[in-house]
């Protein structure tokens, strides 16, 4: 009788994670007597996957009827495959003895595991940035196999080109991770913009995974200020408004200064939203001109989103509003605490 051969017909087998892998092995002879064992890897560190003789291998089942001696098929099925199962599997015939001795090994079957990438996670900068600045976004996805993968960046549907991508590790591994950094130039219109990271992989059957970041989390649009004097409401009153325009996010505090002294502080509440996602707000101040002998410098000072304050001033000419003969303000007459500046917002 010819010497036993161990035949592993498949050089490689590719299986999707979660599925079962069938590894084929047949022997050409019934002798010598002794068990078949399956190993992953070769050499002294090889890992026992299945032993016909003994042991508990809950994920492994024999494919054919193993209770008949004439059975020479020692193929196995490994259930619930994960990327960690990737490797070369060897079917090995042992000769019965004390100890059992390796008689002959098959050529090996390389098992590769197709594992889907995790949903891409896009993260932006830790601090907000203003228009015209360039910010970096990162995209990460893990656990995929094989290594080949495609990553694209988009801003509002337009593909970006300024990005760098790495797939790790560089060498052989059971699974891989991708890390990409894209540079995006912010514009004032980006409050409603989205940055999208798109990952395509063989396991996704043409339906790529996407991760998104809203630029509203990243952008800060500083306000423009305009202080205007409205027509007088009464002969001795002037209405001064501070228009705070095109700002984002909404967090804003406004302080009125009269000749450098704080007159009133308020927080933006009833704002109006522009189409581009920025906000407008208006604050007004009613100034009793008759309370002032000299010109008044009114300053609208805005602190937006914790940034250094910006301000706009308006000079109110008192001389332009002559007082009536003998009609001094109550404050001047009585020295009372009655306020001479009134304000509001809208």
């Amino acid at each position: 009788e010819e010497e036993l051969q161990v035949i592993q017909p498949d050089k490689s087998v590719s299986v999707a994670a979660g599925e079962s892998a069938i590894l084929h092995c047949t022997v050409t002879s019934l002798i010598p007597v002794g068990p078949i064992q399956w190993f992953r890897g070769a050499g002294p560190a090889r890992e026992l996957i299945y032993n016909q003789k003994e042991g508990h291998f809950p994920r492994v089942t024999t494919v054919s009827e193993s209770t008949k001696r004439e059975n020479m098929d020692f193929s196995i099925s490994i259930s619930n495959i994960t990327p960690a199962d990737a490797g070369t599997y060897y079917c090995v015939k042992f000769r019965k003895g004390s100890p059992d001795t390796e008689f002959k090994s098959g050529a090996g079957t390389e098992l590769s595991v197709r594992a889907k990438p995790s949903a891409p996670v896009v993260s932006g900068p830790a601090a907000r940035a203003t228009p015209q600045h360039t910010v970096s976004f990162t995209c990460e996805s893990h656990g995929f196999s094989p290594r080949d993968i495609t990553l694209k960046w988009f801003k509002n549907g337009n593909e970006l080109s300024d990005f760098q991508t790495n797939v790790d590790p560089v060498g052989e591994s059971v699974s891989y991770s991708i890390h990409s950094t894209a540079k995006v130039v912010l514009t004032r219109e980006d409050v409603h913009s989205q940055v999208i990271c798109e990952v395509a992989h063989v396991t996704l059957q043409g339906d790529p995974l996407r991760g998104t970041a809203n630029l509203s989390e990243t952008i800060r649009v500083p306000p423009t200020l305009e202080v205007t004097q409205q027509p007088v409401r009464a002969e001795n009153q002037v209405n001064v408004t501070c228009q705070v325009r095109k700002f984002y996010p909404q967090r804003l505090q406004l302080t009125w200064l009269e000749n450098g002294n704080v007159s009133r502080t308020e927080t933006a509440s009833t704002v109006t939203e522009n189409k581009d996602g920025t906000y407008n707000w208006m604050s007004w101040l009613l100034v009793n001109v008759s309370a002032h002998r000299d010109d008044v410098k009114l300053t609208c000072q805005v602190e937006h989103d914790g940034q250094p304050a910006v301000s706009k001033s308006h000079d109110l000419k008192v001389s332009a509003h002559p007082k009536e003969q003998g009609s001094n303000t109550a404050a001047e007459n009585t020295g009372s605490n009655e306020r001479n500046i009134y304000g509001g917002s809208g």
Partner: antibody, heavy 118, light 107 residues
């Protein structure tokens, strides 16, 4: 059903011969290592002989040169030719099938009695 | 030849008892040890192979253990039908050899 049935036992004089047969059913005998085991009256079990799937044969020391194990695939049968019989060969002879991969005994026949006496 | 020494040669026990029979090989036999049960006038019945694997149809009250030279057969809860003679065997190399047997009797 997997079964082994021995036959051919009986009374024989010392120096005489006997041929035991074992008919197998429910499996292909040639695919298994097959054995003969005996048990002298009131004694324990003693392995006697074996034949491998390649026709290789093995014997316990006390029967070497006197007993011959063989099989006939067409009849799915195992045989033990016993020559130069001695009183010490008196025993029940069992035909036994070796296991699928390790030759562990799994199926036993009911046995046939061989008595060597003058 | 490899000798198989079984102990005890006889054992008295009661129904419900847990009993253990041991077998020692004169040299290492890996785990190629088998156990058989034989009742008077009957052919032996295969119980255990490769030291701890149960043959098909053998109740789980029978268990085996060991490797190398020392092996045990344990019957967890004796029933009347378990009173018989038990043999160990090595089948790592020819000539295959049996222990002398342990006769398990009702106390």
């Amino acid at each position: 059903e997997v079964q082994l049935v021995e036959s051919g036992g009986g009374l024989v004089q010392p120096g005489g011969s006997l041929r035991l047969s074992c008919a197998a059913s429910g499996f292909t005998l040639s695919s298994y290592d097959m054995h003969w085991v005996r048990q002298a009256p009131g004694k324990g079990l003693e392995w006697v002989s074996a034949i491998g799937t390649a026709g290789d044969t093995y014997y316990t020391g006390s029967v070497k040169g006197r007993f011959t194990i063989s099989r006939e695939n067409a009849k799915n049968s195992l045989y033990l030719q016993m020559n130069s019989l001695r009183a010490s060969d008196t025993a029940v002879y069992y035909c036994v099938r070796g296991g699928v991969w390790d030759d562990a005994f799994d199926i036993w026949g009911q046995g046939t009695m061989v008595t060597v006496s003058s | 030849d490899i000798q198989m020494t079984q102990s005890p040669s006889s054992l008295s026990a009661s129904v419900g008892d847990r009993v253990t029979i041991t077998c020692r090989a004169s040299q290492g036999i890996n785990n190629y040890a088998a156990w058989f049960q034989q009742k008077p006038g009957k052919a032996p019945k295969s119980l255990i192979y490769t030291a701890s694997s149960l043959h098909s149809g053998v109740p789980s009250k029978f268990s085996g253990s060991g490797s190398g030279t020392d092996f045990t057969l344990t019957i967890s809860s004796l029933q009347p039908e378990d009173f018989a003679t038990y043999y160990c065997q090595q089948y790592v190399s020819y000539p295959y050899t049996f222990g002398q047997g342990t006769k398990l009797e009702i106390k």
